[in-house]
Interface confidence: low
């Protein structure tokens, strides 16, 4: 019996036309939301005039759908066992499941201030980057509705900039009608023990942002894994939202719908210092933000967002170390909240929940030249906003995998 | 390697006008974007005008706006600065920088750039 039903996983596990995967992987069967909270900055004038802690509320969530539009330029490559695909960005405002609307306004960082200073550090450069600053107006902080901070504003001091430039931000532009990829993964014809595991991203097996083995492309992109999941296995997954690969771990055993699931977790090690786990040294870019790569709990991904220096970390900077977090008031990180599983069915691979959780922060350095952050006396990681994008397996679906899999192993 | 070499510097009365030019040598001129500055004896070093690559957008400092225009010849390479109305404050060395950095996003000016000797402009009133 238990044979049959391997090879009967086996076959349906496979990604290609007619089989269980292969239909749910193009377009996914699950509501995937995206919830987002703001950090709204409480005392923007005392931070900027005395240097003092950030004082933050978040308010939230504001929900968006996510993850709704198929797959796009599927084509599969019988010569390597490979099926590559765009994955296309898409939102929408989920008005009943949000705290308020797209026209709510936040004081928060001004992004342009801050991305420019750091990028331009030379002295004469910042002489005229304080000089267009002054005449736009423009602050260490500004304040701008959510629509504007998500999906992207005209800026008024980069619009003053003499050069060909982007003028257009917002940290999540552009999002709507553009796409993730192209992905190269493997379809597990010749080999199931690779199915969905990444082959190559955007044409390479590497990344180009960290050094060593910090820049491979590992395993699958976590909406699947290779059938027949042992509690045991460190589950090795890229995420293209934080330019790296990571990994989860076994946690506890659930029940989700009547569905035996493994529970996977990101643990406190994956973000942990060198000196904590001597395997994060190459994701330690820097010695002066980073004390000489004895903070954690941060991922400087500047290299991956042309230069501007983003910061990624688990909301409220769950396991991050104290001094990343001291000039920030009004944090509260906890694990329940604000962590990062995947429920994965063991026999298919498939992942039927998953709650991925992570914080943006920009980081802000004191600068002489530049008048509205000349007062500051340290650097500050300030937290901008927070997400947790949620999937759960519908009831129809579950019902259905309950019968024709679970089902016949019990 | 870049060379930039400055020239219309000279003596003026109040009033008057002058034509600085810059040639540069060494690089594809027009992949970049050029800038004037200036500075007066016991000051620092200051932001004057700037040009882009395509010569399409330009950007003055408020005590020369209305008064300098600043303009490229790609086919040249030389970027200039028509500088009219001059008043005695105006009087300084005047410096153009080109950016070795630019890559065609975000503000190009990375790093400290290459400059040219100087040519100094005096104002009499």
């Known amino acids: 019996g238990d044979l049959l039903i391997q090879k009967t996983i086996k076959k349906q596990v496979v990604l290609e036309e007619g089989t269980i995967a292969f239909k749910n992987w193009v377009k996914t069967g699950t509501e995937v939301y995206r919830q987002f909270w703001i950090f709204d900055v409480q005392n923007p004038q005392e931070v900027m005039m005395n240097s003092s802690n950030i004082q933050v509320k978040q308010r939230g969530p504001y929900t968006y759908r996510v993850r709704f539009l198929a797959k796009e330029n599927v084509t599969q490559d019988a010569e390597d066992n490979t099926v590559s695909f765009l994955q296309p960005n898409g939102a929408i405002f989920e008005p009943s499941l949000s705290v308020g609307t797209e026209a709510d306004n936040f004081t928060v960082l001004n992004l342009a201030v801050a991305a420019a200073s750091h990028i331009y550090q030379n002295q004469f450069v910042q002489m005229i980057l304080n000089s267009l600053i002054n005449k736009s107006k423009s602050s260490m902080f500004q304040v701008r509705t959510l629509r504007e901070l998500l999906w992207g504003y005209r800026d008024p001091f980069l619009s003053l900039v003499p050069y060909p430039v982007t003028t257009t931000v917002g940290l999540f532009y552009p999002y709507n009608n553009t796409a993730d990829g192209v992905y190269k993964v493997f379809n597990g014809k010749d080999n199931i023990s690779k199915v969905a595991i990444i082959d190559t991203y955007k044409g390479k097996r590497n990344l180009s942002y960290w050094e060593s083995h910090c820049d491979m492309i590992n395993g699958t992109d976590a909406a699947s894994f290779p059938p027949f999941v042992e509690k045991s296995q460190v589950l090795q997954f890229f995420s293209s939202d934080i330019c790296r690969s990571i990994y989860a771990v076994f946690e506890s055993d659930v029940n989700l719908k009547g569905i035996p699931v493994y529970r996977f977790v990101l643990p406190s090690k994956a973000f942990a210092s060198p000196v904590e786990n001597p395997d994060n040294y190459c994701f330690c870019t820097e010695k002066i933000i980073s004390k000489n790569c004895t903070s954690y709990g941060v991922l400087d991904i500047s290299k991956c967002k042309e230069g501007r220096p983003v910061y990624i970390s688990l909301p409220h900077f769950l396991y991050a170390s104290p001094d990343v977090s001291e000039p920030i008031d009004g944090l509260n990180p906890n694990e329940e909240e604000h962590r990062t599983y995947l429920d994965i069915e063991p026999i298919t691979g498939f992942t039927l929940q998953f709650a991925k959780r992570l914080q943006v922060n920009l980081l802000v350095k004191p600068s002489e030249k530049i008048q509205v952050l000349k007062n500051l006396k340290r650097n500050y990681i300030v937290p901008i906003l927070w997400l947790n994008e949620t999937g759960t397996i519908g009831d129809e679906k579950a019902n259905m995998f309950r019968s024709q899999v679970t089902g016949k192993i019990n | 390697q870049v060379q930039l070499q400055e020239s219309g510097g000279g003596l003026v009365q109040a009033g008057g006008s002058l034509r600085l030019s810059c040639a540069a040598s060494?690089?594809?001129?027009?992949?970049?974007?050029m800038g004037w500055f200036r500075q007066a004896p016991g000051k620092e070093r200051e932001f004057v005008a700037a040009?882009?690559?395509?010569?399409?957008?330009?950007y003055y400092d408020d005590p020369v706006k209305g008064r300098f225009t600043i303009s490229r010849d790609n086919a040249k390479n030389t970027v200039y600065l028509q500088m009219n109305s001059l008043k005695p404050e105006d009087t300084a060395v005047y410096y153009c920088?080109?950016?070795?950095?630019?890559?065609?996003?975000?503000?190009?000016?990375?790093?400290?750039?290459?400059w040219g000797q100087g040519t100094q402009v005096t104002v009499s009133s």
């Open positions: 920088n080109l950016d070795p950095e630019y890559s065609g996003t975000w503000n190009p000016w990375a790093g400290s750039g290459y």
């Open positions: 060494g690089r594809t001129f027009s992949s970049y974007a």
């Open positions: 040009i882009s690559w395509s010569g399409g957008r330009t």
